[in-house]
Amino acid sequence: ELCLYDPPEVPNATFKALSYKNGTILNCECKRGFRRLKELVYMRCLGNSWSSNCQCTSNSHDKSRKQVTAQLEHQKEQQTTTDMQKPTQSMHQENLTGHCREPPPWKHEDSKRIYHFVEGQSVHYECIPGYKALQRGPAISICKMKCGKTGWTQPQLTCVDEREHHRFLASEESQGSRNSSPESETSCPITTTDFPQPTETTAMTETFVLTMEYK
């Protein structure tokens, strides 16, 4: 099941997936002046590697069919070299079957990557430089199915200015630790949901990639 919408934003924080679940789709997007090869519309996480490598080619000259075919034949070879690009395996990186790592950069890709996440995907939040975390729970958001719909859980993270951090800590102690209410797993009220409501801008549009894939 695909996750609708994007994960929630937290002020003065940024998030990203540290690994991608089996079935995740990444659109092959190219920056202005370049276009993707017709045969490579998206990459999909299968097992613990991506199904193909995105490639962008200049708009200014058309490659011959022969060249394109040759590039496609080299994909398997390129996929193997991808695994050699990481000399150190970090403890922070999940390396499980059914999870893919971040695909390495490809030439002339668009600056923004468009992922289509699947149920169970988690994204990890960190405060940006200059801000410190006040945490009451895990700084992650998980795409979950609830009442027949997918949505993202709210990360338990507040990022405050480093210069103000001590003041927030003091007020936290004087108030006592407030418990964030656990998610209700049983009831499915008609009007409310445990998921934060996405704004219009975060609503993820179904793209032709998905239409093609799930016909």
Epitope: T14, S90, Q93
Partner: nanobody
Amino acid sequence: QLQLVESGGDLVQPGGSLRLSCTASGLTFDGYAIGWFRQAPGKEREGVSYITGSNGSTYYIDSVKGRFTISSDIAKSTVYLQMNTLKPEDTAVYYCAVDRLGSRGLYASSWWRSGDMDLWGKGTLVTVSS
């Protein structure tokens, strides 16, 4: 396949300067943090410095603050590390690396410190010795 190519490593005397270059032809800079790690003999690899392509924000490990400066020339697809007042403890293989930015084109220094990068260069040796 996009590759990172480092250059500029050399033997230099303590107190001297060097400038390392990392060229990443075809890299879409504004989607990445790009910068430098180093690994001294018998030690763990450590994140020295990065610059984000989205807004040019920079990070330095404490031991190089005030001595090293990172900069980029997007037109040349190159990131530089200017290293001044070099010390024997700066001796290491210096690796160029890139890591995808997080949401809204922002980046957290903890991701760089974790050492889990999307792409690595082959490294260039810097030796500081008299």
